[in-house]
Interface confidence: low
C-alpha cells in the first residue's frame, strides 16, 4: 500500500517558499484557530437516542496529547419510554484527524504525521437485515 | 495537552521553549485509507437523524477534501418513516487538525490548523423551556 504524501500539489512553487530537505516538510505547530470551541447542543451525548460516553486518551509522545473518544452506551437505541429498543442500532460516527508523533533517538527528536480515527459520537440507524435463503 | 521533555543529559538549547517549527517526515503514517464517508458506510441514509454530505475542497489544505454533514430535518424519522418534530436532529461536531500551506502554494511548508467539522447527526430529546 502506498503511503500518501502531503507535499504533492498542482501549484507552481513560488520563489518565496522556504528551503526544505528532501523527504521532509516544514511544519509550524503554532495552531491557527487554537481557541476555537465546539458549539454543540448541550450534553447531546446523554440526550441522544443513541447515547455515548467519552474517554480521554493521553499520550505525551503525540500532539495533541489528549484525544477524546466516544463509545456508544447501548447496542440498541433508546425509545420514547426510555427503554432500549434492540430493533434499532446505536452505531459510532467516526472522523479522521491528523496528529504529530514525536520519536526520541538518544538526544535527537524526529516527527511524523499520523492520521488517527476518532469516534465522535453515535447515531441511531435501522439495521440492515440479511435474509438467509 | 501534555508534552514529553528532552532527555536528561541532552545539551540544553538556548531557548527553553519547544521549537515552534519542526521538520516532519513527508510520509503520513496512516492506517485509515478510506476518507470518503459515502463509501465507508451508509449511516447517513439509515439514521433516524439522516444527513447529507457536502464536499468541502481547498487545495491550500491537507486533506484537501473534507466532507461536511448537514442534518436533513429538524425532527427525527419515526418508525413509520415520517418526521417526528417532538425530537430533534442535531449535528455532531468535532475539532480536527489539518495542514494549511504556509506560505500559500508552497508544496512542503505547512502550519497546523484546527477546524470544526460536522461529522454526522444524532437524534435527541429537545430541551423544553417552560415560559412562566
Amino acid at each position: 500500500r502506498k503511503i500518501p504524501k502531503v507535499g504533492h500539489t498542482f501549484f507552481q512553487k513560488p520563489e518565496s517558499c522556504p528551503p526544505v530537505p528532501g523527504g521532509s516538510m516544514k511544519l509550524d505547530i503554532g495552531i491557527i484557530n487554537e481557541n476555537q470551541r465546539v458549539s454543540m447542543s448541550r450534553n447531546i451525548e446523554s440526550r441522544s437516542t443513541s447515547p455515548w460516553n467519552y474517554t480521554v486518551t493521553w499520550d505525551p509522545n503525540r500532539y495533541p496529547s489528549e484525544v477524546v473518544q466516544a463509545q456508544c452506551r447501548n447496542l440498541g437505541c433508546i425509545n420514547a419510554q426510555g427503554k432500549e429498543d434492540i430493533s434499532m442500532n446505536s452505531v459510532p460516527i467516526q472522523q479522521e484527524t491528523l496528529v504529530v508523533r514525536r520519536k526520541h533517538q538518544g538526544c535527537s527528536v524526529s516527527f511524523q504525521l499520523e492520521k488517527v480515527l476518532v469516534t465522535v459520537g453515535c447515531t441511531c440507524v435501522t439495521p440492515v437485515i440479511h435474509h438467509v435463503q | 495537552g501534555i508534552t514529553i521533555p528532552r532527555n536528561p543529559g541532552c545539551p540544553n538549547s538556548e531557548d527553553k521553549n519547544f521549537p515552534r517549527t519542526v521538520m516532519v517526515n513527508l510520509n503520513i503514517h496512516n492506517r485509515n485509507t478510506n476518507t470518503n464517508p459515502k463509501r465507508s458506510s451508509d449511516y447517513y441514509n439509515r439514521s433516524t437523524s439522516p444527513w447529507n454530505l457536502h464536499r468541502n475542497e481547498d487545495p491550500e489544505r491537507y486533506p484537501s477534501v473534507i466532507w461536511e454533514a448537514k442534518c436533513r430535518h429538524l425532527g427525527c424519522i419515526n418508525a413509520d418513516g415520517n418526521v417526528d418534530y417532538h425530537m430533534n436532529s442535531v449535528p455532531i461536531q468535532q475539532e480536527i487538525l489539518v495542514l494549511r500551506r504556509e506560505p500559500p502554494h508552497c508544496p512542503n511548508s505547512f502550519r497546523l490548523e484546527k477546524i470544526l467539522v460536522s461529522v454526522g447527526c444524532t437524534c435527541v430529546t429537545p430541551i423544553v423551556h417552560h415560559v412562566a
Epitope: - | 501534555i2 521533555p5 527553553k16 519547544f18
Partner: nanobody, 117 residues
C-alpha cells in the same frame, strides 16, 4: 534556578508498592503542570502521569491506570507518585518533569525503580 529532585525509588517485589517524591524548587507548582515519565532500557520514553493543577485534571498512561496515583502538595512544593500492584514491566528510570504542552521542559535526574522477585 529551577530544580526537580526525585526520590523514593528502589527494589520491590511484584505486587508491592512504592511512593516516589519530586521536590521542586525555583518555581511554584501551581504554575506548571508536573508529571512523571519513565524510560526502560531500549524502550521509548513513556508518559506515566501528569497533574495539571491549572485545569484541575490528572492524566495517566494506559499501562498504569488504576494502579498509580499522582498527587501534589503545594505547601511542600512536592509531587508524589503512589505506585501500587507493581509489575516487572514497571521497571524503569522514573523522571519528574514539567509536562505543559510544547513549553518548558525541566527534568529531574531520575530515580531507578526495579520490580523483581
Amino acid at each position: 534556578e529551577v530544580q526537580l529532585v526525585e526520590s523514593g525509588g528502589g527494589l520491590v517485589q511484584p505486587g508491592g508498592s512504592l511512593r516516589l517524591s519530586c521536590a521542586a524548587s525555583g518555581f511554584a507548582l501551581g504554575y506548571y503542570a508536573i508529571g512523571w515519565f519513565r524510560q526502560a532500557p531500549g524502550k521509548e520514553r513513556e508518559g506515566v502521569s501528569c497533574d495539571s493543577s491549572s485545569d484541575g485534571r490528572t492524566y495517566y498512561g494506559d499501562s498504569v491506570k488504576g494502579r498509580f496515583t499522582i498527587s501534589t502538595d503545594s505547601a511542600k512544593n512536592t509531587v508524589y507518585l503512589q505506585m501500587n500492584s507493581l509489575k516487572p514491566e514497571d521497571t524503569a528510570v522514573y523522571y519528574c518533569a514539567t509536562c505543559t504542552d510544547f513549553e518548558y521542559d525541566y527534568w529531574g535526574q531520575g530515580t531507578q525503580v526495579t520490580v523483581s522477585s
